[in-house]
Amino acid sequence: ALSPCESQPCQHGGQCRHSLGRGGGLTFTCHCVPPFWGLRCERVARSCRELQCPVGIPCQQTARGPRCACPPGLSGPSCRVSRASPSGATNASCASAPCLHGGSCLPVQSVPFFRCVCAPGWGGPRCETPSAAPEVPEEPRCPRAACQAKRGDQNCDRECNTPGCGWDGGDCSLNVDDPWRQCEALQCWRLFNNSRCDPACSSPACLYDNFDCYSGGRDRTCNPVYEKYCADHFADGRCDQGCNTEECGWDGLDCASEVPALLARGVLVLTVLLPPEELLRSSADFLQRLSAILRTSLRFRLDARGQAMVFPYHRPSPGSESRVRRELGPEVIGSVVMLEIDNRLCLQSAENDHCFPDAQSAADYLGALSAVERLDFPYPLRDVRGEPLEAPEQS
């Protein structure tokens, strides 16, 4: 059967994500590009109530309808495009991307022919210095009272998806409390999704600035021509050099049989909303895609009998569970998956300083991608965490 997103239900450029329907089945959610909204992004917003702007960007009602009020230097329906220079002004000064740490560059008529509009927490002519007091202070508390009631309801409420609201109590960050909690540079969560190298945020604690500082950045993805092929041939016992890259998941270590394993500390534990037998049927695809996202090698942890550690995840039972349901046993709605991270090829690559040293840092990275709505993974994840390594139990 086709997965819900395979029929491409989202219109007008909307992004399709798998989610869990009311009955426990797999359904889809469309993340629409403004001004479109609706179940399939089929409707056009007529008021600010219907328009979803990115977190922190207000909606403005104009004569031509609602629009996102982009900050200086940004444009486009979702304020994701660096605005072109005013007509007549040269853009050459901005061509070298002089503004650091997510600052936007505006061409001006006098030397040096550009002005940087710095991201919160950064200052200086090129946004090179952390400002003592961030221009926009970190939200110490969650400003919206309604968010308190929505925390932990397994639904990512975008208006609550802020650090102050704990990323909607973890609902938007795969239940990772704060993916950036180890990061000392305050604004890195704002800069994580800007496709620019922010050196202050490129440390492991700051989740490598979403790989923006590495050659090709995170735009270096597995060639679509190879992608399906690499998933089919992942860990199939044949070395495929075209798939033996970090962005294609290192071919499931097929080309590394002579290289000794280098396991990251701990176990990466994912809750996936697919039952074990269904997940294991597409295990190679699942592992290849996740390996490509984390740019290292992943495999299932094995128990003492050599079986993959993929366990049933049951629907959390409310008190008023029907007697019939109880007699049938708890309903399996997903899998708890335990993964090992093998950095043998990541650490051998030319840029070998961006490997996840432990499972928790990999979990934080996945949580961060989810929080900024950039986790491009077709398997529905409920939560992710790193756990310390214990020897598999003998049975």
Epitope: A235, G237, R238, C239, S257, S282, R299, F300, L302, E340
Partner: antibody
Framework: QVQLVESGGGLVKPGGSLRLSCAAS????????MHWVRQAPGKGLEWVGR??????????DYAAPVKGRFTISRDDSKNTLYLQMNSLKTEDTAVYYC??????????WGQGTLVTVSS | DIQMTQSPSSLSASVGDRVTITCRAS??????LNWYQQKPGKAPKLLIY???NLQSGVPSRFSGSGSGTDFTLTISSLQPEDFATYYC?????????FGQGTKVEIK
């Protein structure tokens, strides 16, 4: 040395079942993708299916003629590969080989075991 | 499924002859083609992998070429021990498939 030994072949009636085993020795069996290939008397080679290592889910793929009837499994604690054959047909009569796939193509094959399906 | 067609299905040759066997895939398989040699009552033996790579321990008189859909196995100077059946096999997509075989006999 690296060795694969198949067993379990024999005479079976159409509609019957049979389980073939392939005992592996001389290498770390659990890390390898394993294949079954068959050859009908006087005919060419036919790929039956394969199974990945359990660390990658232990998922199996099958050729169309056997899909739904044959099941490949492995027991890494016993270093053994299995082929469970159900609803056997006369056209399943063949020598069945197990084979180890190797990244650098140092393939290893067993000597084969004959399965005869006849009434 | 990807169909593999070998030609000829059989050939007669003498020791010292140059022998060429071709294999055609029903769709492009890049260079994912292997050549096997099989003697009666024995398991197949891998000669060439990934279209043109000689398996270790295989004499250099065997060579492979081609990519996409058309492939060739060449034996530059046939030896007595080379009389056997040769199979091509694609491992580009499951189900992996073999050609029907080419039997090389003594003239």
């Amino acid at each position: 040395q690296v060795q694969l030994v198949e067993s379990g072949g024999g005479l079976v009636k159409p509609g019957g079942s049979l389980r073939l085993s392939c005992a592996a020795s001389g290498f770390t069996f659990s890390t390898y993708v394993m294949h079954w290939v068959r050859q009908a008397p006087g005919k060419g080679l036919e790929w039956v299916g394969r199974i990945r290592a359990n660390a990658y889910g232990g998922a199996a793929d099958y050729a169309a003629p056997v899909k739904g009837r044959f099941t490949i499994s492995r027991d890494d604690s016993k270093n053994t590969l299995y082929l469970q054959m159900n609803s056997l047909k006369t056209e399943d009569t063949a020598v069945y080989y197990c084979a180890r796939a190797e990244a650098r193509y140092r393939d290893v094959w067993g000597q084969g075991t004959l399965v005869t399906v006849s009434s | 499924d990807i169909q593999m067609t070998q030609s000829p299905s059989s050939l007669s040759a003498s020791v010292g002859d140059r022998v060429t066997i071709t294999c055609r895939a029903s769709q492009s398989i890049s260079s994912h083609l292997n050549w096997y040699q099989q003697k009666p009552g024995k398991a197949p033996k891998l000669l060439i992998y990934a279209a043109s790579n000689l398996q270790s321990g295989v004499p250099s008189r065997f060579s492979g070429s081609g990519s996409g859909t058309d492939f060739t196995l060449t034996i530059s100077s046939l030896q007595p021990e080379d009389f056997a059946t040769y199979y091509c096999q694609q491992d580009y997509h499951t189900p992996f498939t073999f050609g029907q075989g080419t039997k090389v006999e003594i003239k």
